[in-house]
Amino acid sequence: IWELKKDVYVVELDWYPDAPGEMVVLTCDTPEEDGITWTLDQSSEVLGSGKTLTIQVKEFGDAGQYTCHKGGEVLSHSLLLLHKKEDGIWSTDILKDQKEPKNKTFLRCEAKNYSGRFTCWWLTTISTDLTFSVKSSRGSSDPQGVTCGAATLSAERVRGDNKEYEYSVECQEDSACPAAEESLPIEVMVDAVHKLKYENYTSSFFIRDIIKPDPPKNLQLKPLKNSRQVEVSWEYPDTWSTPHSYFSLTFCVQVQGKSKREKKDRVFTDKTSATVICRKNASISVRAQDRYYSSSWSEWASVPCS
Amino acid sequence: RNLPVATPDPGMFPCLHHSQNLLRAVSNMLQKARQTLEFYPCTSEEIDHEDITKDKTSTVEACLPLELTKNESCLNSRETSFITNGSCLASRKTSFMMALCLSSIYEDLKMYQVEFKTMNAKLLMDPKRQIFLDQNMLAVIDELMQALNFNSETVPQKSSLEEPDFYKTKIKLCILLHAFRIRAVTIDRVMSYLNAS
């Protein structure tokens, strides 16, 4: 058993039929010695008396809010949560496996630049009685500070018969240098509590590996005289790290016909312009990627050819 | 300050070109190592990230762009140098700070060159003959060092009398390649910045 926060405790249980469970001793936080009784949740049934209560925790029915009283007055509370371990593996019932970029990916994180700020998000089909708390650091043995805000319900979508809820958190490394070469990864730890079930999820990454620039901005077309060719120009996104001559991007320019089956013409360039042939009803799209470290491409910025 | 993309200074351009070749070569070598050594811990998640140049050179700090000198987190504790102009030592205008930056890059390359050559000698003794260092990568390191044009005594290859542990050598190769790739990215950024300044 360990303390998650004040008066909230997590009992770690091996979860299998007829498992013996864990013996837990609760102590009433009071100077009083006599006349103390214990109850669980809203029930008035007295579970025991005395300053300590010993219970055998085997299942969710044994978890909950234990309260010690004296003469009708509440003295203190202890909330017991269960953390299940099945076949040596901690349960992951609360969050959905996003399977991207690999199986068992519960937390996904992205950064727009090298400023040390990043966003993580996760998915669940649970709509109520759900709380998350997020901690982060750079490195684990001698951790350096990363400050995270509160996890927020940020999107909801219908997936088949189910509603899927997305929660997000924004974090900022306390002292980040955009030019630094990372040798210790960022660690993100999410505590999830659904009713009386506790689970924890972790992710470890380097900012350089989760970079996904915003799409190029101010995408414009300039027709070239007496030609089907156009000059496409664009700019670096506002959110990208500066100076741009140090944090350079590379670009992919694509000409796509109306039909998805039509052949796509693609050009790669380090410049912020390109000359392409504009077909009727086609659109021109441009996306960006760090020129020197191949993390994710941005989403496409698009303009119609007409 | 968003620097305009100017016509490259002919003196600087060789260094930019060589640094791009270097990044390409080390990235290819790392990819090859990851594929060939698939049953070894060779991915970014599996290895310990070590920097053989730590406390010996200060490339990141010495080559910090002027725009980042206002960021206290970039200044660290050591005396930092800022690059402001330059053309790979081909121009008389090359400042002292620039020279410090480029000499730090040169020292990085020299250290990695020694490590890689020593490691290759060990790998050539491996009866499995599983992996060797790409000669192209070694050549590109050499070319960039020559383009940087520092006069420096040749460092002898480290020799080892004990029987090499090939498993450890291959893991060390992965660690070195990951670290060198990160340094090659920094070198490329620096050369691109200098080329535009």
Partner: nanobody, 115 residues
Framework: EVQLVESGGGLVQPGGSLRLSCAAS????????MFWVRQPPGKGLEWVST????????RYADSVQGRFTISRDNTKNTLSLQMNSLKPEDTALYYC????????RGQGTQVTVSS
Amino acid sequence: EVQLVESGGGLVQPGGSLRLSCAASGFSFSSSWMFWVRQPPGKGLEWVSTISPSGDYSRYADSVQGRFTISRDNTKNTLSLQMNSLKPEDTALYYCARDLRGTMRGQGTQVTVSS
């Protein structure tokens, strides 16, 4: 006292554009996630878009993805929603909110898309 005041609604033809604004006060705007939600005539509240405190990260309901853009200016405590390629089904009362469910929202601004 928390205040959210929306503006910029109006009548627009299908395919047209509108830009909604929300002036926020009485709370720490720059550290709050912000949301746009809407209520079509005769229906319940539905979530439209979300933006993170820094403005780095945004999310959209499938029905508006690619047409609407959420943004914020933390120096002016304002939230915006740029709505392009508007459709009749976008007709609704639009609210700026501090949560996805719209429990903490402003008075709303009416958007009508009709020819």
